[in-house]
């Protein structure tokens, strides 16, 4: 076990040009506060995954008001160290994130408004009991100077904090099979403290609160003897002295999650829900307070001053969860219609349009044809995101700009002859037929089948097609 | 780091089928939080989007490409693919393969280096 | 489709100049728009994002302004590494749309 600290110098504008606007003002007086979430290993784990090492919250730094018209400073902090517990030993690679957040004090409904200025991370290799390091990261315009180290919690000792020591009992030498405790000579090396309750005469430990079983016992505690009088079950390795199956400790078996959480199998281990007031890998960290930042994800807690009354985690958008730890998939519902796409963009969701839609859902189909005009008397026709032009007879193209051929499509019935013309077309029936494209057949007694041909217009002439 | 590759014939006939594939390296093609885009150049001009996919599959398309693209991928391999079919010369262009971010806000962060695939006889 | 235009389309200035590139929509895109830097031979790099995000490792001196329809992107003292051709993008709806793009060079 140990604590690592950090300790925030400063947090201003970075150098170079374009030197970010304070973030406070006459008329929003603000002040800072930082957050700390440690990871362990070096993997680039996913901003929202949880602080499995860790995480605190500071106190919040002094009021500050930007003098009108001077540039930012460096920002006035609040007091002492962030401290971040760890009850196992130290990894010695781990990842860190550390948001500067803003307070602001103005008149605001409801409380008051946290905004998040200035997000930091990194990959780090730390040996526990090393001095101080000293960092710089920088965040668009804002830079952060601070320091960091991992120490032990006495009786632990050693790099990773996994080496317990004590006093000597006696004075010359230490008990047996036990080594002094370089740098600690007066000290010894402590016998391994196996996890609480593991069974003495069944269970054993090669790391600081583990419990491992010695064969024929099972159970987080190694508790319970195995059965070998069934061999049903297809877990665990095969007996010796049976020759079946001996069903060993599936990780849910004994329920090792403390404190009332409830154990589910993951493909790896196993992973624990923990009521409220509880966190760690087995719910075995209780009396957590806001002092413990137990609010993930950028989530703010309130309440909890001490380890009796409960905090409460207000979660950013698209986080829920006791903690803020489950991220909130928002475009699951599909709230955007007509195939567009829903973007999730913290503060709000928003649809973008697949072409000929648009409205916040994606639920207008646009019109088309609107400010799109087809020329010489064409008409708009709409469909599927696109516009296309119904030309007037003897134009075409898209938008009916280009002269058409209007006898292409050969429109005289009957063998009638075709013959362009500046306002469209005229046909020149053959004998016997008439009408504007030589449709209609002239009666033998000279009547036609339909209306009779306008004055001065005798059958067999051409017939004008306006 | 992150990384894209393309791969695939710099030289295509016309009306054949133009095939790349993008590479990712670096990071999962199945994350929740991207789309994976072409992007083309041609010679001396300006960048056109041609689509984008999703590791699910989802698929948008540039409408002025649309009847002639086809982009697919395979988490299996962590590649996605695009494939234009009946290419003339004016699809002669660098083609690039993009990481378009979806939460939070919106944009293409992280690019190949780009292939020129030339359409000639 | 969202027609995108720029100005000027190319521009000589010097060190540290102070450089302006606007961008326009045909239709307000709200701030969902992005300026991106290509340099010849290379991909495009992106500088800002959201009109006016910087794209974490990009230099302060370049920023972005703008919504609905105008935008621009200044470079507040230009240096030897900016000159390249610089193309906003609206991400507002299908199809996504690039600006023809401006090329800086020196003077």
């Known amino acids: 076990a140990g604590v690592f600290e950090l300790q925030i110098h400063s947090f201003g504008p970075g150098p170079g040009p374009g030197a970010p606007r304070s973030p406070c003002s006459a008329r929003l007086p603000c002040r800072l506060f930082f957050r700390v979430c440690l990871k362990p290993g070096l993997s680039e784990e996913a901003a929202e995954s949880p602080c499995a090492l860790g995480a605190a919250l500071s106190a919040r730094g002094p009021v500050y008001t930007e003098q009108p018209g001077a540039p930012a400073p460096d920002l006035p902090l609040p007091d002492g160290l962030l401290q971040v517990p760890f009850r196992d030993a130290w990894p010695g690679t781990f990842s860190f994130i550390i948001e500067t957040w803003r307070e602001e004090l103005g008149d605001q409904i409801g409380g008051p408004a946290w905004s998040l200025l200035a997000r930091v991370a990194g990959r780090r290799r730390l040996a526990a009991g090393g001095p101080w390091a000293r960092d710089i990261q920088r965040a668009g315009a804002w830079e952060l100077r601070f320091s960091y180290r991992a120490r032990c919690e006495p009786p632990a000792v050693g790099t990773a904090c996994t080496r317990l020591c004590r006093p000597r009992s006696a004075p010359s030498r230490c008990g047996p099979g036990l080594r002094p405790c370089a740098p600690l000579e007066d000290e010894c090396e402590a016998p391994l403290v196996c996890r609480a309750g593991c069974s003495p005469e069944h269970g054993f430990c090669e790391q600081p609160g583990e419990c491992r079983c010695l064969e024929g016992w099972t159970g987080p505690l190694c508790t319970v003897p195995v059965s070998t009088s069934s061999c049903l079950s297809p877990r665990g390795p095969s007996s010796a002295t049976t020759g079946c199956l001996v069903p060993g400790p599936g990780p849910c078996d004994g329920n090792p999650c403390a404190n009332g959480g409830s154990c589910s199998e993951t493909p790896r281990s196993f992973e624990c829900t923990c009521p409220r007031g509880f966190y760690g890998l087995r719910c075995e960290v209780s009396g957590v307070t806001c002092a413990d930042g137990p609010c993930f994800n950028g989530g703010l807690c309130v309440g909890g001053a001490d380890p009796d009354s409960a905090y409460i985690c207000h979660c950013p958008p698209g986080f829920q969860g006791s903690n803020c730890e489950k991220r909130v998939d928002r475009c699951s519902l599909q709230p955007c219609r007509n195939g567009g796409l829903c973007l999730d963009l913290g503060h709000a969701l928003r649809c973008r349009c697949r072409a000929g839609f648009a409205g916040p859902r994606c639920e207008h189909d646009l019109d088309d044809c609107a400010g799109r005009a087809c020329a010489n008397g064409g008409t708009c026709v709409e469909g599927g995101g696109a516009h296309r032009c119904s030309c007037a007879l003897g134009f075409g193209g898209r938008d009916c700009r280009e002269r058409a051929d209007p006898c292409a499509a050969r429109p005289c019935a009957h063998g009638g002859r075709c013959y362009a013309h500046f306002s469209g077309l005229v046909c020149a029936c053959a004998p016997g037929y008439m009408g504007a494209r030589c449709e209609f057949p002239v009666h033998p007694d000279g009547a036609s089948a339909l209306p009779a041909a306008p004055p001065g217009l005798r059958p067999g002439d051409p017939q004008r097609y306006l | 780091q992150l990384q894209l590759q393309e791969s695939g014939p710099g030289l295509v006939k016309p009306s054949e089928t133009l095939s790349l594939t993008c590479t990712v390296s670096?990071?999962?093609?199945?994350?929740?939080?991207?789309?994976w885009g072409w992007i083309r150049q041609p010679p001396g001009k300006g960048l056109e989007w041609i689509g984008s996919?999703?590791?699910?599959?989802?698929?948008y398309h540039n409408p002025s490409l649309k009847s002639r693209v086809s982009i697919s991928v395979d988490t299996s391999k962590n590649q996605f693919s695009l494939r234009l079919s009946s290419v003339t010369a004016a699809d002669t262009a660098v083609y690039y393969c993009?990481?378009?971010?979806?939460?939070?806000?919106?944009?293409?962060?992280?690019w190949g280096q780009g292939t020129l695939v030339t359409v000639s006889s | 489709a969202i027609q995108m235009t720029q100005s000027p389309s190319s521009l000589s200035a010097s060190v540290g100049d102070r450089v302006t590139i606007t961008c326009r929509a045909s239709?307000?895109?709200?701030?969902?728009l992005g300026w991106y830097q290509q340099k010849p031979g290379k991909a495009p790099e992106l500088l800002i994002y959201?009109?006016?995000s910087l794209q974490s490792g990009v230099p302060s001196r370049f920023s972005g302004s703008g919504s609905g329809t105008d935008f621009t992107l200044t470079i507040s003292s230009l240096q030897p590494e900016d000159f390249a051709t610089y193309y906003c993008?609206?991400?507002?709806?299908?199809?996504?749309?690039f600006g023809p793009g401006t090329k800086v060079d020196i003077k």
């Open positions: 670096g990071g999962s093609i199945s994350s929740s939080s991207y789309y």
């Open positions: 959201a009109a006016s």
């Open positions: 239709q307000g895109i709200r701030n969902d």
């Open positions: 993008l609206q991400d507002y709806n299908y199809p996504l749309t």
């Open positions: 993009a990481r378009e971010i979806i939460v939070g806000a919106t944009h293409f962060d992280y």
């Open positions: 996919i999703y590791y699910s599959g989802n698929i």
